[in-house]
Each structure stands twice: as structure tokens, then as C-alpha cells.
């Protein structure tokens, strides 16, 4: 229903703690390089300005639209173009392409420090002086520095660090309380951040089609009881949220994420046995915990697939008939019938039907044609299959640290030109996928381990647009989404690439690596390591090793000498002249 | 919505000749065979001759083989059948159908071949 003032309904649904919270988030998100105090002084000016719109709906500038609203207060902040430069032009463009432009303005990588930490006295006296402002110092940090993270979901994160606070600030021993659970929280956090990027990459780049195609998939294979009915209905619901939150309304997506675990909580009976817990719990939990609940158990007599697909004399009448909505059923039955596949899977599939009936049905006799589909199929899932295997294997064999490396020396073969830092973040984080899923029951792997990977690669991905430099990385970027983690596994050793020269400074190491934390030892050594391949695209696995544990036992060496100045000037010399000779 | 309605049908006497056609909409036409299948009075469904969507490949069953042609026109989107050489046995009502389908959605036309 329309209602006259957008922002007192928005105001009055969500009440004043979440309405700020995410007028705070889309603020941070848009201008990522303004302090919090300088946020925080628009969105009380703008909360102040949605109680007078409750108070009085037909008060003045009331019933303009969000973005208006929003767009105003951006164009209004003091030396905008100094600071932001090209991006004060979109304050010269009126709604909606102000809009897109503030958009388009959005940064994956802003040039700001890491989010640190402080040590844990530190964090608790200014937590318990004003939690309201700690926290809100946590969603302009976190926010800022990922401009696409799923709003709603942020809040929630918020509301478990506020709770882990409240708990570990009241231990005698809070660093040790607070330490393993807020590690927790910032990995999830970081792993929703990239999904969420995904889901955004996917509506931008090929519209609401193709993100409501990734919804049946994942949706079926949660609920495997509901009827196509009921998961087109969700799907396209969570497409709406999706499109509003990667489009920055905030406010409307939080509203109607609300609303749409309402609904599913009023549903059960028709949607999935497994919602009751999430039903219980208050609004973020419960909207969280149904983004993430187990899979429904899969009903007993489930017909073969291709009985309708496939055998069914009706198959290309019934594609002319309604195209999408046959591909839609085709989709969901498979995946209803398939917890045990990627998303990204299921959606090749899609495809390879798709195409199969496009050239199929075009033919004389059809039937003899596409009779073969679901064989054809099998190529494509052994692929993955492979995939895993192998990887969850050498992951097994070398531990967390080691599969990282080996990721590493692979794509900096595969995409030499690429930044080092670039190499290693993405190295470190496709490296995770081997605890984050390779210790979960084999069903569970598969789906963990490619949708993983692929929100990954779309990082890279949209790394690499900002300063394409890998023609590699361009073609497997340029094509869909579910082709480029197939395209970036096939890629080999990038032959056009003419090697670095061996710069010494390069691997020239100082006593300050000795008091670094675990983290950044690690990151200093896989940096030297992916200069090594850069320098020698097609040094073996065995002369890397040769040469990473000597620098390995180096470090060990003069970290542990009682003048490690002297130890790292004389011994770091050796050491290059020893890598140059076993790379030679 | 997809239609597909036939025309053409009607007596006509042993050994003479009728062309039947079928007007598509609501689809891309050129993207899919199409065929005819025929119902004789009291009989089941018989499917008589398809055609590629580009109008190159045909097939025909062989009660009809060297008598009947199909043929298509993807910028009328209409399908066609010339049926020479009629016999009594080819009364029926003659459908027209996407891809392999045996089973019509349209009313078809009747055909009777009698002297």
C-alpha cells in the first residue's frame, strides 16, 4: 500500500534503534572515507527529520522518496569533492540517477587501514561507557570497508558483539573470553560479506532473472516439501530484498526481510518442517537462522527426473508453452532432489537443459534428440566432484597454512600479473574453503566448497576490473557467474607471461618479522613466495619447498638469536644467494 | 499464450489432393519442430510427419511416405501439410503439434477422403 510519508513508515515499522542503525550503515556505505562522527551527525539529523514525518505525515518534504531524502543529506556534507572527487558530480544528477551514480561510486577495496582490534581492557571501558556509540563505531567500520554487506544481517552481527561484550566484560580474564569469540564472529561476518557480494554481482551484472534462478535452486534444496508454488513465492520475495539491499534501500530491504521471515514462520506447514527453532527466537536471530537452516528431510517417493523432462511426450510443447516457468520446474525438481550439489551446479544444469531443448526442439524429431539430456549431465558433475576431492585431499595432507600455499604457486602460474597482495588475500581466503568445509560429511561438501570458491573468484574478480592486468583473469571474469570457477580450475601455467626479475630487496627480510602476530608472518612469507613464482613461473613444486623451508628454518634461526639485527644482515644475504641457486 | 489453429480440411473424392495449414502464435515459432498427427474416427492418435524448425529436415511415417509434404513458413509462422494421393484410410481430424507432441491442445480439422 502507498503510504504519504515513506520515511515515517519505514521510521514506524522498524523502529528508532534498527531505523538508525541502517540509515548509519547506507550512509557508511555510500561515503566510505567520512569519519563516524561526521556519519553520525547526518543520521541523527535524519531520525530527528522521520519524527517530525510520524508526528505529522503532511509535513513539510515528507512525502519525498528515501533516496531523495538520503541523496540531499550526502550532497549537502562540506568539501564533498575534495575529498570524494568524481563522486560530487552524481549531487549534479537528479533521482533516480543520482542514485546508480552513488552506486557506481561504490568501492571493493577502499584504501583504509584494517579494522584493528584494540586489546580487550581498551574495548570494554569504551563499550561500557556508551554501547551505543561502540557499536555504532562497529557498523561505519565494518560497513565502509564492505559496501555490499547485507544490511540486516550487519545489524545482526552487531547484536551478537554486543552480547559477546556484555558477557566477556564482566570475566576476570576478558581478553581470553572475547578473543576465539569475536574471531568467530568476524569470520562469519567476512564469509557473508563475500556471499552477499555475489548475490549483488549477479543482480547487476545479469539482472533479477538470473539471481531468482540461484533462489529456486538454494530454496529447493532447503525445502524440499514446499511445491513450486510456495518456492517461487519465496524466491521472488528474496529477490526483492536482495535487489533493494544491493541497491542501497536499506531501510525497504530490511522491512521486507522482516517480512518475509513472517511469513515463513506463518507457513511452516507448507514450507518446512525444520523452521520452528528460528521461529522462536527475536527478529535478527530469527531471520538469520532461516537464511541458514538445515535442509528438510527429502519426501519418500520423489518420481525419477526424467520422467517429466525427459521421457514425458509433452517436453517441447510444454517449453514453448511458458519457457521459463518449465526451465523453473525443471530447476526445482532437480535441486529438491540434490542438497547434495552446488548451487552453482544445478545451475550449469539448468543450462545445459535450457540449450539442450533450444537446439533440440528445433529439430524433426526431438525426442531422439534431447533422450540422451541427463546422460550428457554426468561430465559436468564429475567435474566438481573431482574438484573437491582432490582438493579436500591435499588440504588433509598439508593443513591449512601449506594448502594456502599451493593454492597460491597455482593461480600466480594461472595470473602471474596480478598484484601480490591481490594473489596472497585470495590464496588465503580459497585456502579456508579446506576447514571451513572439508572436515563436513561428503554430502555437504560439494555445495560448501564450489559456492565458497565462486564468491571468492567474484572478489577477484572485481579486484581485477578496477586494473585489469591477466588476460586469463578477464576471460574467466567476463563470463557468467556459474562458468568461472570451471574456467579458473582449467586455467594453467599463463604462457605469454615474461618472468620478474630476481630483485633481492625483494626477499630481504628485518628483525621487525620476529614480534609480527602468526597472521602477518604468514602473509610476509606467502608474499615472498608468490614473488618466487612470479620470478620463476615453472619452478617445480619441490625446488619451492627447497627454498620456502629455508627461509622458514632462517626466520626460526635469527628470531631466536640474541642479536637478531646481525643475524638478519649477515644470514639474509646467504639466504637470497641460496634461492637464486636452487631456483637457478 | 501459445495457439495453434488448423485450416484447409474438408470431402474430397479418392486419389485427389488437399493442403492443410497451421497458424502459430504466442511462441518462437522458428525455434521448434512442429508436427501433424492424425485421429481416425474411433481410433487412437497417429502421428504423421514433423518438420525442423528451420524447415530442413522432415520426416514422415511410412502410411504417408511420397503421398503428403510438410512444409513451414517461419515468417507466417504457419505450418503446412500437402497431402496428394488421398485414400479413404487418411480421414481423420488432422492436428498440429510442437515438437514430439502426440497429444493436440487445438481442435484440428477433419478430413474425409470418400467417393
Known amino acids: 500500500e502507498a503510504h504519504k510519508s515513506e520515511i515515517a513508515h519505514r521510521y514506524n515499522d522498524l523502529g528508532e534503534q534498527h531505523f538508525k542503525g541502517l540509515v548509519l550503515i547506507a550512509f557508511s556505505q555510500y561515503l566510505q572515507k567520512c569519519s563516524y562522527d561526521e556519519h553520525a551527525k547526518l543520521v541523527q539529523e535524519v531520525t530527528d527529520f522521520a519524527k517530525t514525518c510520524v508526528a505529522d505525515e503532511s509535513a513539510a518534504n515528507c512525502d519525498k522518496s528515501l533516496h531523495t531524502l538520503f541523496g540531499d543529506k550526502l550532497c549537502a556534507i562540506p568539501n564533498l569533492r575534495e575529498n570524494y572527487g568524481e563522486l560530487a558530480d552524481c549531487c549534479t544528477k537528479q533521482e533516480p540517477e543520482r542514485n546508480e551514480c552513488f552506486l557506481q561510486h561504490k568501492d571493493d577495496n577502499p584504501s583504509l587501514p584494517p579494522f584493528e582490534r584494540p586489546e580487550a581492557e581498551a574495548m570494554c571501558t569504551s563499550f561500557k561507557e556508551n554501547p551505543t556509540t561502540f557499536m555504532g563505531h562497529y557498523l561505519h567500520e565494518v560497513a565502509r570497508r564492505h559496501p555490499y554487506f547485507y544490511a540486516p544481517e550487519l545489524l545482526y552481527y552487531a547484536e551478537q558483539y554486543n552480547e559477546i561484550l556484555t558477557q566477556c566484560c564482566a570475566e576476570a580474564d576478558k581478553e581470553s573470553c572475547l578473543t576465539p569469540k569475536l574471531d568467530g564472529v568476524k569470520e562469519k561476518a567476512l564469509v557473508s560479506s563475500v556471499r552477499q557480494r555475489m548475490k549483488c554481482s549477479s543482480m547487476q551484472k545479469f539482472g533479477e532473472r538470473a539471481f531468482k534462478a540461484w533462489a529456486v535452486a538454494r530454496l529447493s534444496q532447503t525445502f524440499p516439501n514446499a511445491d513450486f508454488a510456495e518456492i517461487t513465492k519465496l524466491a521472488t520475495d528474496l529477490t526483492k530484498v536482495n535487489k533493494e539491499c544491493c541497491h542501497g534501500d536499506l531501510l525497504e530491504c530490511a522491512d521486507d526481510r522482516a517480512e518475509l521471515a513472517k511469513y515463513m514462520c506463518e507457513n511452516q506447514a507448507t514450507i518446512s518442517s525444520k523452521l520452528q527453532t528460528c521461529c522462536d527466537k527475536p527478529l535478527l536471530k530469527k531471520a538469520h537462522c532461516l537464511s541458514e537452516v538445515e535442509h528438510d528431510t527429502m519426501p519418500a517417493d520423489l518420481p525419477a527426473i526424467a520422467a517429466d523432462f525427459v521421457e514425458d511426450q509433452e517436453v517441447c510443447k510444454n517449453y514453448a508453452e511458458a519457457k521459463d516457468v518449465f526451465l523453473g520446474t525443471f530447476l526445482y525438481e532437480y535441486s529438491r532432489r540434490h542438497p547434495d550439489y552446488s548451487v552453482s551446479l544445478l545451475l550449469r544444469l539448468a543450462k545445459k537443459y535450457e540449450a539442450t531443448l533450444e537446439k533440440c526442439c528445433a529439430e524433426a524429431n526431438p525426442p531422439a534428440c534431447y533422450g540422451t539430456v541427463l546422460a550428457e549431465f554426468q561430465p559436468l558433475v564429475e567435474e566438481p566432484k573431482n574438484l573437491v576431492k582432490t582438493n579436500c585431499d591435499l588440504y588433509e595432507k598439508l593443513g591449512e597454512y601449506g594448502f594456502q600455499n599451493a593454492i597460491l604457486v597455482r593461480y600466480t602460474q594461472k595470473a602471474p600479473q596480478v598484484s601480490t597482495p591481490t594473489l596472497v588475500e585470495a590464496a588465503r581466503n580459497l585456502g579456508r574453503v579446506g576447514t571451513k568445509c572439508c572436515t563436513l560429511p561428503e554430502d555437504q561438501r560439494l555445495p560448501c566448497v564450489e559456492d565458497y570458491l565462486s564468491a571468492i573468484l567474484n572478489r577477484v574478480c572485481l579486484l581485477h576490473e578496477k586494473t585489469p592486468v591477466s588476460e586469463h583473469v578477464t576471460k574467466c571474469c567476463s563470463g557468467s557467474l556459474v562458468e568461472r570457477r570451471p574456467c579458473f580450475s582449467a586455467l594453467t601455467v599463463d604462457e605469454t607471461y615474461v618472468p620478474k626479475e630476481f630483485k633481492a630487496e625483494t626477499f630481504t627480510f628485518h628483525s621487525d618479522i620476529c614480534t609480527l602476530p602468526e597472521k602477518e608472518k604468514q602473509i610476509k612469507k606467502q608474499t615472498a613466495l608468490a614473488e618466487l613464482v612470479k620470478h620463476k613461473p615453472k619452478a617445480t613444486a619441490e625446488q619451492l619447498k627447497t627454498v620456502m623451508d629455508d627461509f622458514a628454518q632462517f626466520l626460526d634461526t635469527c628470531c631466536k638469536a640474541a642479536d637478531k639485527d646481525t643475524c638478519f644482515s649477515t644470514e639474509g644475504p646467504n639466504l637470497v644467494t641460496r634461492c637464486k641457486d636452487a631456483l637457478a | 499464450e501459445v495457439q495453434l489453429v488448423e485450416s484447409g480440411g474438408g470431402l474430397v473424392q479418392p486419389g485427389n489432393s488437399l493442403r492443410l495449414s497451421c497458424a502459430a502464435s504466442g511462441f518462437t515459432f522458428s525455434s521448434f519442430g512442429m508436427s501433424w498427427v492424425r485421429q481416425a474416427p474411433g481410433k487412437g492418435l497417429e502421428w504423421v510427419s514433423s518438420?525442423?524448425?528451420?524447415?530442413?529436415?522432415?520426416l514422415y511415417a511410412d502410411s504417408v511416405k511420397g503421398r503428403f509434404t510438410i512444409s513451414r513458413d517461419n515468417a507466417k509462422t504457419t505450418l503446412y501439410l500437402q497431402m496428394n494421393s488421398l485414400r479413404p484410410e487418411d480421414t481423420a481430424v488432422y492436428y498440429c503439434t510442437i515438437g514430439g507432441s502426440l497429444s493436440p491442445s487445438s481442435q484440428g480439422t477433419l478430413v474425409t477422403v470418400s467417393s
Open positions: 518438420i525442423s524448425g528451420s524447415g530442413s529436415d522432415t
